[in-house]
Every structure is written in structure tokens, then in C-alpha cells.
Amino acid sequence: LEASEEVELEPCLAPSLEQQEQELTVALGQPVRLCCGRAERGGHWYKEGSRLAPAGRVRGWRGRLEIASFLPEDAGRYLCLARGSMIVLQNLTLITGDSLTSSNDDEDPKSHRDPSNRHSYPQQAPYWTHPQRMEKKLHAVPAGNTVKFRCPAAGNPTPTIRWLKDGQAFHGENRIGGIRLRHQHWSLVMESVVPSDRGTYTCLVENAVGSIRYNYLLDVLERSPHRPILQAGLPANTTAVVGSDVELLCKVYSDAQPHIQWLKHIVINGSSFGADGFPYVQVLKTADINSSEVEVLYLRNVSAEDAGEYTCLAGNSIGLSYQSAWLTVLPEEDPTWTAAAPEARYTD
């Protein structure tokens, strides 16, 4: 997208109820105008669960989302809900680009491989577009887990990416289960990792102007018999209205006696993670599996402060397992929406 262009979704007609999620890359400084529903009965716009005011630099007004000049902090998930109902009219993520090509880890490949982009700007050597997604360098992953390494990059011409393992070209042909190379997502995915997957994984990003590289160090930890198993999908993402009661459920299976904790993720000094790489958490509930209803976390009379990420952590003599869910708390008068499920993560 050229910096002078305006990002628009037109016309302003009520879309189908089967609204697909969209991702749009927006150049810094670019104006944005997105429409949702008919002007007279336009929907309400929300950013990350908070309703946008009708005035200000970023505003939701008569069914329109308007951003005068796109800034990095404007990136994120935007939702438009029909007035007086829970119908999702628009569900999209705005991604920060720049005056050159840009890419997001999971964006539509067309958005940064458009040939019309290729000659619009001077040539540029590859550069990392999302270095914050590459901060975790030393990975220690239990055997059987899935590992995803990402090296989102851009440049002109659009660079290519290839992967090395311990300095050698890596295509996964000798790996049971193979690998998934998603070049348009700049990612390498390995499922059910085993000790032979240990090593240094290098992403090499190149174009005619130059090249950059980044190393991920992977260790695979063997654990037998097994740590607790948590039922998939639990706890579930939940949306509640202020003042209501919420129950989060966690189903734990374990041979060895498990110990269960409910945690709420918190922010300290503006950071969600401590120096050790683990998230800051507050312990809400702790007990053994035999305790009554330890697998349920009750939140009474929820307020906006209760919104956030909750984790069920189960441990036994072998190790730890955990799964997380998001609680979204909306004002009483506003319709509800359910946040996207967080990425599955492994314990470092």
C-alpha cells in the first residue's frame, strides 16, 4: 500500500453474517476509514474489547472506523458489532507496515508479494519486520510438543527465506513427520519434537541486495512417563458482562498425584514477563486433585479488572502442563464478543 492511499472497506453495506477474519497491513502515517453496516444503523467498533469513542484520533462513528494517521500503537484487533445484538459485522486485524513492503507472521501472502510493490520503491536489503517475535532464542521444549520458529522479514525485492539446521540446508526429509515450511509466513513448524531435533536452526533471508540470518537454539527435554494431560479446549475463552459470575473449567488427567493451580496473568512495571522468561502471574487457587472442585475457578461479580488471561497449571513428579483462556468483560450495555484463542505454548 502506498503511504498516500487511504485504507477503505467499501461499500458501507451490511456484510453477510459469515464475516471472515481479515488482516490489513497499513503503512505508518496512512489514513484509515473502514465501514461497517449502513451509515444510519452502523455498528459499534471495538479495539481489543474496548469500544471506540465517536471522537478522537481513532474513532468509531456512524459505523465507520476512522484513523487520521496510522501509528504503531493503532495495530491490533478491531471488531464491529451490530447495534443491539451480538452479530459480528467486521472482524479484522490491522498490522503495522511502513513506507516499504511489510509482512506479518500470519498475513495473506498476497499482501507482501504483490508484484506492483516490487518496483515502487528503491531496492532495500532484507530487514526484520517483527523482531519482538524473535526474542526467545534458547528454547527448551518437552518431547512431543510442537515448535514454531518465525523470522518475519521484508525488503525490496521481496526476500526469500531458507532454513538451516546446524549449518546444513534443512528440508526435514529425514525427520519423522516432516516439517512445515510456510515461506509466506516466514515460519518453520515441527510437530512432535524428539531428541534428534535438537540443534541450531538458522533462518537465512536473502534478496539481491543482501542477506540477514538469525539462530534459534532448540533443546528437546525427554520426560517419561508423562506430565499431567489437560483436556483440549479447557479452560475455554469466555465473555461476561460486568457484575455476572464466571466459571472456568480445567480437566486434568494424571497417573502421578497432580497439584493444580489457577493463575491470573498480570503486568509488573509495564512488562508481562520476568527476566527468567516466565510470565508474571498471581496465584488465585491451589490444591491437590482430591480437593473438591479444584478444577473449577469461580469468579463472582466480575469487573473490568477481572478481564485477562487465566491459566490452569497442573504439575506432578514428572513435570508441568498448562492451558490458558481469556476472559473478556464487557460493560452491561454493550454486546459481547469472544476473544480469539491464544496460541498454544510450551513450558520453558
Partner: antibody, heavy 118, light 112 residues
Amino acid sequence: EVQLLESGGGLVQPGGSLRLSCAASGFTFSSNYMSWVRQAPGKGLEWVSSISGSGGRTYYADSVKGRFTISRDNSKNTLYLQMNSLRAEDTAVYYCARMTVFGAATLWGQGTLVTVSS
Amino acid sequence: QSVLTQPPSASGTPGQRVTISCSGSSSNIGSNTVNWYQQLPGTAPKLLIYRNNQRPSGVPDRFSGSKSGTSASLAISGLRSEDEADYYCAAWDDSLNGPYWVFGGGTKLTVL
């Protein structure tokens, strides 16, 4: 208490060998990458070697490659550095350090002095 | 010769703000996060800043870090006499034969 305690330093002649140990306590040793860092008298910090939690992967500075070997015994919560063919320039205080997923050393031992001299 | 370049010394008076720079290349600071360590005389190093600008718990907010391109800096505001120490920047280096963990040569901070 979370701590690292080095031992094994001392005086050794050029060409000789020495084995350093680092006893860890208070954290899950087996899932942490560990490193050795040294500091020559009056000089700055220099990375020597790192090892993955399982011990399956090791990494070395060019200055010690082929002479030093890093290893660990997770059942004893102990990190080792076997130093062979020692040179005068290997004289330093050797620290062991616990690494985080972000590649930073959050925990350091108090250090052990290795002197290589004839 | 250290891979990362720091000024050998810096100084300031109590209450002042002091900045220490750290210069590297695309293979280290340009691609990896920067950490800062404080080493008080006769003691082991201590982590001061990680992930470019994050402080571990217990580190006063007088210490702050930043990174831009292939350079990083550590700022100390409201300088105190107990801040007199050696300060080291560090980052992983992903050059051809890497990975390596590299340090700056250290900056000796004197509180006048």
C-alpha cells in the same frame, strides 16, 4: 535458595588440565541452558561456552574450541568445564551462569580463579 | 578486541543522568536482544536490563535501556554513589560460524 557455586579453580602449569564444577540449587536445573563466562584480571567479560538443558547441544568460543569441554550431570545438578592444554591467557575468574529463554544470564555464581603459570 | 564496542569510561555527579553506549553489527545487536550487566567491585556480574529495555525485579527504575538498529544504550538517571561499577552490554551473535554470546569491553562508571 537459588544459587550457583563454582569450585575447582587453582594454579596449573601451561599445557596442564583442570576441571571446574558448578553446583546449582533452588531451580529446575535440567531445563535450563547454562554458560561459562570468564574474566581475566583487570579485563572484561568473555563468553567461554554454553550447553543446553539436556546436554545434547554445546557451543564454544573460538578461543577455547578443541581445548575445553562443557558438560553437565542433571542428576547431580552440576555443570562442568573440562579445560585441557591450558595457556597463560586462560588465566581468569570463571563464572557459571544460568541462561533464560531470552538469552540473558539471570543468575551468576561467585566465580573461581584459574591461574595458568609456570 | 571486543565484538561490541563500549566507551571505556564514563562519569557523572550524584543526581545526574549518564548514558553508556554499545555499538555492534547486524548479526548481533541488529538481530538479537541486548542485555546489560552491572559488576560492582570484587563481585560477580548482575543482570540489569534484558530484552533491550526490561528490568528484572529489584532493579530500580533509574536504570533504563534502549536499542535502535545496531546500537544500544543504558541510561542511569539520578546517579548515586552506589552506581559506581563496571557496566557490560551483551548479545547473541548470529554470524556465519555462530551462535556466539558476545560482550562489550565494559564501561567503568565513576561517580564524582
